[in-house]
Amino acid sequence: HTAAQDNCTCPTNKMTVCSPDGPGGRCQCRALGSGMAVDCSTLTSKCLLLKARMSAPKNARTLVRPSEHALVDNDGLYDPDCDPEGRFKARQCNQTSVCWCVNSVGVRRTDKGDLSLRCDELVRTHHILIDLRHRPTAGAFNHSDLDAELRRLFRERYRLHPKFVAAVHYEQPTIQIELRQNTSQKAAGDVDIGDAAYYFERDIKGESLFQGRGGLDLRVRGEPLQVERTLIYYLDEIPPKFSMKRLT
């Protein structure tokens, strides 16, 4: 499950360049854009993935901007600054010196300001609500079967421990997946819920980040689950700080 030795590729991140120049001639993979070494046995951080996405040549980008329906991440794509561990830096700025603070999933959580803006800490997103609407089917899915398949998907495809899948709600045609992971719950080696949600979001859009693995084929008792829209809501451990003007 690490970088594949035989053909030296990264199973968990196609946005990498790999070569057998690691210790002992082992396959080592680096993320496009940042050049940072990535652990191919687990998900790559969302920050490095966004950076790689922005660095890809425009004509080679088979990926699309997040749809305008996204309610929370409505700033869309940007070229983020990542720390040496691949996490988002708390303060992000663009080329015109406009700056803002982000949470651990890279979503803006303050008004935009200038270079004097201070972001004291990276605030953790501890609760993610993934809201899906599935295409019409002959009948509703069985809730417990749907619950089981989605928990298994997050465990087996995204390597997210089932204890972080707080709940799966279903009222046809809406499915809600709740991911919860406090700072104190996340142990070394645990996949971050933000990274799992991002991989899932890209899978749902048909833009799988996995190398050589088939696209997402989600079935419940053999019946295909086809998603026609996705909304993702992020809740931070510390509430965001927006001015009243933005809220009106």
């Epitope: 499950h1 690490t2 199973p11 417990s144 619950d147 089981a148 398949e149 928990r151 298994r152 465990r155 087996e156 390597r159 997210l160 421990h161 089932p162 204890k163 899948v165 080696g189 996949v191 693995r213």
Partner: antibody, heavy 118, light 109 residues
Framework: QSLEESGGDLVQPGASLTLTCKAS????????MLWVRQAPGKGLEWIGC???????TYFASWATGRFAISKTSSTTVTLQMTSLTAADTATYFC?????????????WGPGTLVTVSS | YDMTQTPASVSAAVGGTVTIKCQAS??????LAWYQQKPGQPPKLLIY???DLASGVPSRFKGSGSGTEYTLTISDLECDDAATYYC????????????FGGGTEVVVK
């Protein structure tokens, strides 16, 4: 840390039986619990699994419908079996995964013997 | 995800080497374990992630492979290595008949 199965018995064909797996020394909620069986002189056969957090269950294709797994207390998991036949005669093991997201079984009970015979 | 294990039985002298192969019907991304089982006992985890030794397992046991092809090699055989060995795919529990291979009996002469 340990696991111990109980409830194995000699039963008639067509009967039902519930096996219990008792866990000691660890928090079940951080793990998946699996049941595996082994017929006399045969290999290991995976039956099913429960994700303790969430309570979702998964079964080998041959076991779906006739077997059920549930968490019955903070330290016990059960395997319910119905419509038993001679082919179900085996030692039944409960096992725990290693707490990661793979299904490596690093803790096993000693097993309990189920004999189905008239 | 069927697991095919060969051979069913293998015999070697003390100090010798045995090789057991396991083939998965689909790519399991190196999520493979090897277990040792002795009569009257539950299986014991030897190797995980295809090549990593479980705690307390001697380095005479070596796992290798990727994709669909995996191998367990036991070198410098000891009498205590006489047992049945099983491979297990640890990638998925969805739509499978059995996660385990059929087993290989190792006889030490």
């Amino acid at each position: 840390q340990s696991l111990e199965e109980s409830g194995g018995d000699l039963v008639q064909p067509g009967a039902s039986l519930t096996l219990t797996c008792k866990a000691s020394g660890f928090d079940l909620n951080n793990y998946a619990m699996l049941w595996v069986r082994q017929a006399p002189g045969k290999g290991l056969e995976w039956i099913g699994c429960i994700y303790i957090s969430g309570g979702t269950t998964y079964f080998a294709s041959w076991a779906t419908g006739r077997f059920a797994i549930s968490k019955t207390s903070s330290t016990t998991v059960t395997l319910q079996m119905t419509s038993l036949t001679a082919a179900d005669t085996a030692t039944y093991f409960c096992a725990r995964d290693d707490g990661t997201t793979s299904y490596y079984l690093n803790l096993w009970g000693p097993g309990t013997l189920v004999t189905v015979s008239s | 995800y069927d697991m095919t294990q060969t051979p069913a039985s293998v015999s070697a002298a003390v100090g010798g080497t045995v090789t057991i192969k396991c083939q998965a019907s689909e790519d399991i991304y190196s999520l493979l374990a090897w277990y040792q089982q002795k009569p009257g006992q539950p299986p014991k985890l030897l190797i995980y992630d295809a090549s990593d030794l479980a705690s307390g397992v001697p380095s005479r046991f070596k796992g290798s492979g990727s994709g669909t092809e995996y191998t367990l090699t036991i070198s410098d055989l000891e009498c205590d290595d006489a047992a049945t060995y099983y491979c297990q795919q640890a990638y998925t529990i969805g739509n499978i008949d059995n996660a385990f291979g059929g087993g290989t009996e190792v006889v030490v002469k």
